[in-house]
C-alpha cells in the first residue's frame, strides 16, 4: 500500500475503561494530530477505518462490527463499545484515507475490572476542595455523549463502598455531589454510577474520582521563613562544617509554584567558587500546605566564608520573602592560666 503518515502509538492517551460498561472513544487524529475535524474530512471524501491489535499479539486485524446487538460500532469519529469485554484490551488504530491521502494513529485501550468497592487499576482524577469554604461541588465526569438529553439517567453516589445516603455534609444532587462544608474527613474516593436505558437494555457508567481537601485561599498567607531567624546564631571556627537550614512554610495555593533558594553575598551558590552543597526536603500537611527545607552546607568553612552574607529567599503566588542567617566566627575560648589570671590582677 502507498505511504501513510503514521503518528505511531499515542501512549499519552492511555485509555482505561471498565469491563461491562459502554465506552465511546474518539479517534485521536482529529483531537491532537490533524488541523481539521471529522466533518471536514468526511466532506472531502476521506474514510475513517478502524482496526486493532489484541493484547500480547502482533497481528493487526479489522474490528468486527457484526457482533450480536452491535456490541462494537462506529459513529462518525467515535468507536463505541456497548459494552466492553475484558478481552477488548489492546492497541486500536484509526486511519483516515482516500486514494491520495493517508494518516493514522494508534492508542492503547485497557479494559479493567473493579472490585466490590470500585477499586481498580484505573488512574483516578483528583478534585481538590477548599477546607471550610462554603458549598463546593464535584460533577460526575466523562458521561457526556452517552445518552441523549431526552433520557433521564439514574445517578447514585458512593464514598468508598458506601452509598451516600443521609450523610451530614455531603448531598447528592443528580450529576453533582455537593459538599456543604468540606472537612478533612471528606477525603477519599467518590464514585458515581449513572444508569440509563438504551434499546430495551440498561447500561451503567461508573466514574471514580479522588477528593482531596486542601487549604483555603481565605487562609493563605505569603511564605513564612521559620529558619533562619533572629534567635539562632551560627558560630563556627574555621575548618568546621557550616550547616544552615532554611525552613519555609507555604500555604496551599492552587497551581502556585513554591520556590526556595539561597544567596551568598547576593549570588546564587552555583555562581560562586566556594564548595557549597544544598539539600532540599519537602513535607506536606493534611491540607497540602507545604514545608520546604533547604540545608546549605559548607564542609570546611574558612574565616572568609564566615564573613559572607547568607540569605534564604522564598516565593509563592502570595509573595516573596527573605531572611539572612546570623553567621559569625567563634572567638577561641580563653586559656585559663594566663588570660584568666591576668583578668584577676595577678602579676
Amino acid at each position: 500500500s502507498e505511504r501513510c503518515d503514521d503518528w505511531g502509538l499515542d501512549t499519552m492517551r492511555q485509555i482505561q475503561v471498565f469491563e461491562d460498561e459502554p465506552a465511546r472513544i474518539k479517534c485521536p487524529l482529529f483531537e491532537h494530530f490533524l488541523k481539521f475535524n471529522y466533518s471536514t474530512a468526511h466532506s472531502a471524501g476521506l474514510t475513517l477505518i478502524w482496526y486493532w491489535t489484541r493484547q500480547d499479539r502482533d497481528l493487526e486485524e479489522p474490528i468486527n462490527f457484526r457482533l450480536p446487538e452491535n456490541r462494537i460500532s462506529k459513529e462518525k469519529d467515535v468507536l463505541w463499545f456497548r459494552p466492553t469485554l475484558l478481552n477488548d484490551t489492546g492497541n486500536y488504530t484509526c486511519m483516515l484515507r482516500n486514494t491520495t491521502y493517508c494518516s493514522k494513529v494508534a492508542f492503547p485501550l485497557e479494559v479493567v475490572q473493579k472490585d466490590s468497592c470500585f477499586n481498580s487499576p484505573m488512574k483516578l482524577p483528583v478534585h481538590k476542595l477548599y477546607i471550610e469554604y462554603g458549598i463546593q461541588r464535584i460533577t460526575c465526569p466523562n458521561v457526556d455523549g452517552y445518552f441523549p438529553s431526552s433520557v433521564k439517567p439514574t445517578i447514585t453516589w458512593y464514598m468508598g463502598c458506601y452509598k451516600i445516603q443521609n450523610f451530614n455534609n455531603v448531598i447528592p444532587e443528580g450529576m453533582n455531589l455537593s459538599f456543604l462544608i468540606a472537612l478533612i474527613s471528606n477525603n477519599g474516593n467518590y464514585t458515581c454510577v449513572v444508569t440509563y436505558p438504551e434499546n430495551g437494555r440498561t447500561f451503567h457508567l461508573t466514574r471514580t474520582l479522588t477528593v482531596k481537601v486542601v487549604g483555603s485561599p481565605k487562609n493563605a498567607v505569603p511564605p513564612v521563613i521559620h529558619s533562619p531567624n533572629d534567635h539562632v546564631v551560627y558560630e563556627k571556627e574555621p575548618g568546621e562544617e557550616l550547616l544552615i537550614p532554611c525552613t519555609v512554610y507555604f500555604s496551599f495555593l492552587m497551581d502556585s509554584r513554591n520556590e526556595v533558594w539561597w544567596t551568598i553575598d547576593g549570588k546564587k551558590p552555583d555562581d560562586i567558587t566556594i564548595d557549597v552543597t544544598i539539600n532540599e526536603s519537602i513535607s506536606h500537611s493534611r491540607t497540602e500546605d507545604e514545608t520546604r527545607t533547604q540545608i546549605l552546607s559548607i564542609k570546611k568553612v574558612t574565616s572568609e566564608d564566615l564573613k559572607r552574607s547568607y540569605v534564604c529567599h522564598a516565593r509563592s503566588a502570595k509573595g516573596e520573602v527573605a531572611k539572612a542567617a546570623k553567621v559569625k566566627q567563634k572567638v577561641p575560648a580563653p586559656r585559663y592560666t594566663v588570660e584568666l589570671a591576668c583578668g584577676f590582677g595577678a602579676t
Epitope: D20, P83, Q113, T156, K163, T195, T202, T206
Partner: antibody, heavy 119, light 107 residues
Framework: QVQLQQPGAELVRPGSSVKLSCKAS????????MDWVKQRPGQGLEWIGN????????HYNQKFKDKATLTVDKSSSTAYMQLSSLTSEDSAVYYC????????????WGQGTSVTVSS | DIQMTQSPSSLSASLGERVSLTCRAS??????LSWLQQKPDGTIKRLIY???TLDSGVPKRFSGSRSGSDYSLTISSLESEDFADYYC?????????FGGGTKLEIK
Amino acid sequence: QVQLQQPGAELVRPGSSVKLSCKASGYTFTSYWMDWVKQRPGQGLEWIGNIYPSDSKTHYNQKFKDKATLTVDKSSSTAYMQLSSLTSEDSAVYYCARDYYGSIGMDYWGQGTSVTVSS
Amino acid sequence: DIQMTQSPSSLSASLGERVSLTCRASQEISGYLSWLQQKPDGTIKRLIYAASTLDSGVPKRFSGSRSGSDYSLTISSLESEDFADYYCLQYASYPWTFGGGTKLEIK
C-alpha cells in the same frame, strides 16, 4: 438475555445442610452483585444477603448470619447459598437476583428454589 | 433496620380501574425504592426502580411517585395480567427490606 437459573425444589432432612445454586447467563457474572431472598409459604419477602463474584465480598442480613453462607464459582458463573442446621422454619422458596452495587436494586430474578425441610 | 409499611395488604378492583399502592419508609431512603410484581406461579419481575423509573418492557400504565417518605405505585387502568402480589423494596441501606406486600385481586 439475562437469565438466572435455579433448580425447582430440594427436599432435605432437619439438622442437615443444603447448597442452593443460581447459574447466571447473558451478562458478565463478575460485574454484578448476586442477592438472595427468602419467601415463606403465604408470607412476604426477606433479604438474606449478597455477594460480589469478582472478589467474593459479602453483606448479610444479621438475621441470617449464622444460617446462610454465600459463595460463587466464577468459572461456571454460578452463585451458591448454603443453608445449615435446617429446621421447618427454613422451608421456603429462595430466590437469587442480581443487582449493580445497590444503585437500582435487584433487576433480574431467578425462578426460585422451593426448599422443604421434612423428616 | 428500615421498616417499610405497605398498604393496603389486599385490594379488590375491577378491570379498567385505577389503583394505587403505598409504601412508607421508617427512615429517609432518598428515592432508593423499587416495586416488584409476583405472579401466582412465583415469578418475580421488577416494574419500577429509583421510585419512579419504569423498567424497560413494563407497560406505561404502571407509574411510581414519591411524596416525602411515602412512595406510591399506580396502575392507571387494570388489565387481567395485573392481578398479582406487589412488593416495595428499599435498597438505601443494608439490610434491604421489603414491604409486607399487597394482594391485588379481581373484583
